[in-house]
């Protein structure tokens, strides 16, 4: 059988969700007047950069957009970006695409995702609402590296 | 099974308050929102509003505002539908619907119903 | 408040025949549509989300399809058990609202 994504509805511990403005990823309470991303999560197939200890190396991708997450250093800086391609071009690869690539790890109930491209970098979301998505290696207060998945049908 | 339980059929007299209520079981209360739809006899469906049990946020289209009150108990997993100044047009049948929390406005799950009538 | 208007308001069909309910909204709502079967004195059932994703346990019989103002609703081979009132309804904003619905009879 062919591979397929997985679907996922994402939110964290504040029940801010991910929401599509244009072609970035803010997080904005979860209310009736947005409507939130259905995340698409798929294994990478090929091994070489896998760390067991990091969690499973995933493709992440908006379901319904040909939009894929991807680390990107800008002035220096680690950066979160959406880049128009489709997840399922990045799994039929044979080599692993590492801009793209997560480190999806289990912290109880919740989601941590990990930078491949740059180790200790997680995806997080501010406290602030209408922030972008972004990449921080300082997980605590401030900003939110746990998220919630729920699988979408 | 999910499954939503409505309270009994309820008759009032005109100018008075109704409450119903709609108790979920089979999945986690905090992960959907809960709406009230009403039917009129022999019509169609009418959304009342929605309550997201988790924010403890409620929405209610404009025709009801002030008139109709929903709130819900996390600890009873427990929705409810008030409605006062009743009048006989408020005669219909009242369902409470599940939505996740991610698609909001999809009622997934339907109560049985709860018949009010409005009569003097 | 946005207006669905489903047509026809009522059809006749046999068993076997393919079926086509078109639901127009008033303004646009993308793909937040959703298509519900209701039989007499029970209480509405999902069948499709989205606009023409097949909610879990509905048969593949039904589905959906349509963006933006216009959508269709269609039943492939219409079984006994199909016969009942149809509604579509937006949730693309609040207040959701609901076509006035179209009755499936028996020919």
């Known amino acids: 059988r062919e591979a397929a994504p997985k679907s996922y509805a994402i939110r964290d511990s504040r029940q801010m969700v991910w929401v599509l403005s244009g072609n970035s990823l803010i997080a904005a309470p979860l209310s009736r007047s947005i409507k939130p991303v259905t995340l698409h999560l798929i294994a990478c197939r090929d091994t070489e950069f896998s760390d067991k200890e990091k969690g499973n190396m995933v493709y992440l991708g908006i379901k319904g957009k040909d939009l894929c997450l991807f680390c990107a250093e800008i002035q220096g800086k680690p950066t979160l970006q959406l880049k128009e391609k489709n997840i399922m071009d990045l799994y039929v690869e044979k080599k692993a695409q590492k801009p793209f690539l997560f480190f999806h790890n289990k912290e109880g109930s919740t989601s941590v995702f990990q930078s491949v491209s740059y180790p200790g970098w997680f995806i997080a979301t501010s406290t602030t609402s209408g922030q972008p998505i972004f990449l921080t290696k300082e997980r605590g207060i401030t900003n939110n590296t746990n998220f919630y998945l729920d699988s979408v049908e | 099974q999910v499954q939503l339980v409505q309270s009994g059929a309820e008759v009032k007299k005109p100018g008075s308050s109704v409450k119903v209520s709609c108790k979920a079981s089979g999945g986690t209360f905090s992960n959907y929102a809960i709406s009230w739809v009403r039917q009129a006899p022999g019509q169609g469906l009418e959304w009342m509003g929605g309550i997201l049990p988790i924010l403890g946020t409620v929405d209610y289209a404009q025709k009801f505002q002030g008139r109709v009150t929903i709130t819900a108990d996390e600890s009873t997993s427990t929705a409810y539908m008030e409605l006062s100044s009743l009048r006989s047009e408020d005669t219909a049948v009242y369902y409470c619907?599940?939505?996740?929390?991610?698609?909001?406005?999809?009622?997934?799950?339907w109560g049985q119903g709860t018949l009010v009538t409005v009569s003097s | 408040d946005i207006q669905m208007t489903q047509s026809p308001s009522s059809l006749s069909a046999s068993v076997g025949d393919r079926v086509t309910i078109t639901c127009r909204a008033s303004q646009t709502i993308y793909k937040y549509l959703n298509w519900y079967q209701q039989k007499p004195g029970k209480a509405p059932k999902l069948l499709i989300y989205?606009?023409?994703s097949l909610q879990s346990g509905v048969p593949s019989r039904f589905s959906g399809s349509g963006s933006g103002t216009d959508f269709t609703l269609t039943i492939s081979s219409l079984q006994p058990e199909d016969f009942a009132t149809y509604y579509c309804q937006q949730y693309s904003s609040i207040p959701y609202t609901f076509g006035q619905g179209t009755k499936v009879e028996i020919k």
């Open positions: 619907a599940r939505e996740p929390w991610y698609r909001l406005g999809a009622f997934d799950v």
């Open positions: 989205a606009a023409s």
